[in-house]
């Protein structure tokens, strides 16, 4: 099991306010666009616009998603893709609230199992590698909602139905209410509120902040954990430096999580994962003879 | 407050059809999905499945595929269960409740209706 | 599909008495387990959620516990009113499912 696993790669055991960020609304620049005498203008903001063919990528994924999960079958794409496009298109990109988001939600509708979920922070790659060889646990990337919406960027402008593939809000430069952050802040909370019994987190043991309360982990995710159905939040370290054998779940910011998530009245567990490579390697392959014996 | 009101009780023959209506007040409709219980006489409750009251899509169990319809009249807040070609063993009390939806997980049902009794009979 | 297993089918008690009613899972479902209690010739009524979570309006000597597999509904001190019919329900999987029921009868 994965008890063996994180054996074998000398690993530490440790028993063990949502931060608002006040943006400025950007009001942006404006930009003169289209021809002829009377000129359109065009709202500029300091973000990339919308991904290149955002619709035809969406309606993709969703028939992708349905076409491996038997469960999601009875999803109809064309309303999903109706239901997202509503949620943003002809809406000021910096005016999205949860509730422009609410009937997605609702054609999106799928039970995860509650305590076989895994948020991470900062190392989304080595969290989707391990739930594509540890299938029966998820991320959020690994429902529809969150893989419809996976590394893509989407805004439309107020009052008129065209999406915006020149720019779109930054969360920093111009405003937190923008689509891409209402939509993850929107799932983020409600997949967290799902979770129970053990929840896992992956952190990036490599960064100056393991724990960010700036992340979607630290501002929603955490906040959203419910104490009446969550026993314990474990944490898993992940080193970078192939010689970096510190106790990283020592860490000042691992001990600032470990504060907030006791006052929620939910223990927390923390883990270091020296070797990540050698760690999924185990993963795909627990029988293997350094998998079961401490290295 | 609160109330989940369903319509009243029938007799039917068997090979005939029934409709119970469940009338939602008190909450927002479409914020709940909305499931179906079965009770036959002295036994237990069984779940036939549920409706989601957005998209209007129903899930069923799978001893209820087939004769069983769930549906929406979602401006009137009602949710609706038909049974065709009824059976002797479709004689039960035909219950409904509501579920909150979180997206990625169901709350119990919170609030049921009082119940319709269907009796199949020759 | 999960099945969830209660026992015992009757529990014969007298008021005043303490008891546990059990409900056990076919596979780990975490803490999404709901207990309702169902009176003769009425609809069931919700008491406990997730295993242990009390519910407003209802009375504190209902309680419950446990995670996994295993689930207890107890009742501290039965009362008159209580004795009925208790079902566990999971809502652990899309497919909801739940326990075939304990009668609660006076001794």
């Known amino acids: 099991g994965l008890n063996d696993i994180f054996e074998a790669q000398k690993i530490e055991w440790h028993e063990g306010s949502h931060h608002h960020h006040h943006h400025h609304h950007g009001s942006g620049s404006l930009v003169p666009r289209g021809s002829g005498s009377v000129p359109r203008w065009r709202q500029q903001w300091s973000g990339p616009g919308t991904t290149k063919r955002f619709p035809e990528t969406v309606l993709a994924r969703c028939v992708k998603y349905t076409e491996i999960h038997p469960e999601m079958r009875h999803v109809d794409c064309q309303s999903v893709w109706d239901a997202f496009k509503g949620a943003f298109i002809s809406k000021h990109p910096c005016n999205i609230t949860e509730e422009d988001y609410q009937p997605l939600m609702k054609l999106g509708t799928q039970t995860v199992p509650c305590n076989k979920i895994l948020l991470w922070s900062r190392i989304k790659d080595l969290a989707h590698q391990f739930t594509q060889v540890q299938r029966d646990m998820f991320t959020l990337e690994d429902t529809l909602l969150g893989y419809l919406a996976d590394d893509l960027t989407w805004c439309g402008e107020f009052n008129t139905s065209k999406i915006n593939y020149q720019s779109c809000p930054d969360w920093r430069k111009d405003c937190s209410n923008n689509p891409v952050s209402v939509f993850w802040k929107t799932v983020s909370r409600r997949f967290a509120e799902a979770a129970c019994d053990v929840v896992h987190v992956m952190l990036n043991g490599s960064r100056s902040k393991i724990f960010d309360k700036n992340s979607t982990f630290g501002s929603v995710e955490v906040h959203n954990l419910q104490p009446e159905k969550v026993q314990t939040l474990e944490a898993w370290v992940i080193h970078g430096g192939r010689e970096d054998s510190r106790d990283l779940c020592q860490d000042p910011t691992i001990k600032e999580l470990e504060s907030i998530i006791s006052k929620r009245n939910i223990q927390f567990s923390c883990k270091n994962i020296y070797r990540p490579d050698k760690f999924l390697q185990c993963v795909k392959n627990p029988e293997d003879s350094s998998c079961t014996s401490e290295i | 407050q609160i109330q989940l009101v369903q319509s009243g009780p029938g007799l039917k023959k068997p090979g005939e059809s029934v409709k119970i209506s469940c009338k939602a007040s008190g909450y927002t409709f479409t914020d709940y999905s909305m499931h179906w219980v079965k009770q036959a006489p002295g036994k237990g409750l069984q779940w036939m499945g549920w409706i989601n009251t957005y998209s209007g899509k129903p899930t069923y169990a799978a001893d209820f595929k087939g004769r069983f319809v769930f549906s929406l009249e979602a401006s009137a807040s009602t949710a609706n269960l038909q049974i065709s070609n009824l059976k002797n063993e479709d004689t039960a009390t035909y219950f409904c409740?509501?579920?909150?939806?979180?997206?990625?997980?169901?709350?119990?049902?919170?609030?049921w209706g009082q119940g319709t009794s269907v009796t199949v009979s020759s | 599909n999960i099945v969830l297993t209660q026992s015992p089918a009757t529990l014969s008690v007298t008021p005043g008495e303490s008891v546990s009613l059990s409900c056990r899972a076919s596979q780990s479902i975490g803490t999404s387990i709901h207990w309702y209690q169902q009176k003769s010739n009425e609809s069931p009524r919700l008491l406990i959620r997730y295993a242990s979570q009390s519910i407003s309006g209802i009375p504190s000597r209902f309680s419950g516990s446990g995670s996994g597999t295993d689930f207890t509904l107890s009742i501290n001190r039965v009362e008159s009113e209580d004795f009925s019919i208790y079902y566990c329900q999971q809502s652990y999987s899309s497919l909801v499912t739940f326990g075939s029921g304990t009668k609660l009868e006076i001794k």
């Open positions: 409740a509501r579920c909150y939806d979180g997206t990625f997980y169901y709350d119990p049902m919170d609030a």
